[in-house]
């Protein structure tokens, strides 16, 4: 539980920028939570650098991170999940920089999965469904989802739809006929917990039907 580095100590080290960012994942492995931190500057020499978290822990003062290549990682049940923890970059017993962080405000959900799109011929729409592991969780259960879709040929023209459920209906008339679409989804905490967008789900690809010339409607695939 060292304090900050004293003036004159570690002179070379102090020339570097040790700013870092972290995210937490709750109940990521059964009842275990995880905390992942990394330096914002990818060129930092991390050889002798360690991370330590102190405070807001259950029946321990501090925990040390494991180093996994460029990231630092903890998996534990010992987060109180209230109040701020002190997360420090250390070399030996000296702290180079510290941040006070409430782990409930840096939550990154797990990516949604099983994304699929089903065309309903009679309704002339597409039903988008996906799954999230958070439905089964005790803590981060309420999420906002961001569904993004684009015509495959439009590199950066994504259309985004925010929703709190895991089902979305896209009207056929809003899409181009006979076109290939890419769709993906990500999630962010939306109640009590705060934090970051999850990684995107794997993309799903679907084709819209041709227009049926006699009726002016699209043909099903």
């Amino acid at each position: 539980e060292s304090g900050y580095a004293q003036n004159g100590d570690l002179e070379d080290a102090e020339l570097d920028d040790y700013s870092f960012s972290c995210y937490s994942q709750l109940e990521v492995n059964g009842s275990q939570h995880s905390l992942t931190c990394a330096f914002e500057d990818p060129d930092v020499n991390i050889t002798n650098l360690e991370f330590e978290i102190c405070g807001a822990l259950v029946e321990v003062k501090c925990l040390n991170f494991r180093k996994l290549q460029e990231i630092y990682f903890i998996e534990t049940k010992k987060f109180l999940l209230i109040g701020k923890s002190n997360i420090c970059v250390k070399v030996g017993e000296k702290s180079l920089t510290c941040k006070k962080i409430d782990l409930t405000t840096i939550v990154k959900p797990e990516a949604p999965f099983d994304l699929s799109v089903v065309y309903r011929e009679g309704a002339n729409d597409f039903v988008v469904t996906f799954n999230t592991s958070h439905l089964q969780k005790k803590y981060v259960k309420v999420l906002m989802h961001d569904v993004a879709y684009r015509q495959e040929k439009d590199e950066n023209k994504w259309t985004h739809v925010n929703l709190s459920s895991t089902k979305l209906t896209l009207l056929q008339r809003k899409l181009q006929p006979a076109a290939m679409y890419e769709i993906k989804v990500r999630s962010i905490p939306d109640h009590y917990f705060k934090g970051f967008w999850s990684e995107w789900s794997p993309s799903y690809y679907f084709r819209t039907p041709e227009i049926n010339n006699s009726s002016g409607e699209m043909d099903p695939i």
């Epitope: 539980e1 304090g3 102190c54 029946e59 109180l80 999940l81 209230i82």
Partner: antibody, heavy 119, light 105 residues
């Protein structure tokens, strides 16, 4: 205003259990830890444990682990401390204290509950 | 477990004098808090995170220190300052010092 109101004094026999309540008002009960601190007559302060009212997670001083149980009822913003297998040296004033999660100090205290253990 | 030793146990001073209370930790502590307690009353938060004054605490009080050595200073004692002061570490198991009693000489 922010207030913690504790239950009244108790007299117990050795080997018995005691349960002290602490009713919170004037703030969001689930937003702060509730800590329990005791003070034997003429002695200093001793932290016993805390509970996170949001999720019920507890953290105990190893000295009391196995004898103290902290619970809460969020519907009535009340925390409880139960101490079992009482001994005469458990005679003390028991305080509940709200934990400030930004700095981890006890920023609001209850008035105290005197527990006397005597045969 | 960290042990916090407060000295002196009793400080006998007159109103208007300067009071210096010490809290020594058996190993390094990042942050220290201080509480004031008067007879028959619950403790009150006094100084938190080494040097921040709790709400309503007069500016004649100050806190300082780092590592294993922390100090609470009262620049000029007022009658209402005579009480017991406890230091406390910020982290589990939130250990308190044994207290320093500031009494009227």
């Amino acid at each position: 205003q922010v207030q913690l109101v504790q239950s009244g004094a108790e007299v117990k026999k050795p080997g018995a259990s005691v349960k002290v309540s602490c009713k919170a008002s004037g703030y969001t009960f689930t937003g702060y830890t509730m800590n329990w601190v005791r003070q034997a007559p003429g002695q200093g302060l001793e932290w016993m444990g805390l509970i996170n009212p949001y999720n019920g997670v507890t953290s105990y001083n190893q000295k009391f682990k196995g004898r103290v149980t902290l619970t809460r009822d969020t519907s009535i913003s009340t925390a409880y401390m139960e101490l079992s297998r009482l001994r005469s040296d458990d005679t003390a004033v028991y305080y509940c204290a709200r934990g400030d999660g930004n700095y981890w100090y006890f920023d609001v205290w209850g008035q105290g509950t005197t527990v006397t253990v005597s045969s | 477990e960290i042990v916090l030793t407060q000295s002196p146990a009793t400080l006998s001073l007159s109103p208007g004098e300067r009071a210096t209370l010490s809290c020594s930790a058996s190993s390094s502590v990042t942050y220290m808090h201080w509480y004031q307690q008067k007879p028959g009353q619950a403790p009150k938060p006094w100084i938190y995170e080494i040097s921040k004054l709790a709400s309503g605490v007069p500016v004649r009080f100050s806190g300082s220190g780092s590592g294993t050595s922390y100090t609470l200073t009262i620049s000029s004692l007022e009658p209402e300052d005579f009480a017991v002061y406890y230091c406390q570490e910020w982290n589990y198991p939130y250990t308190f010092g044994g207290g320093t009693k500031v009494e009227i000489k």
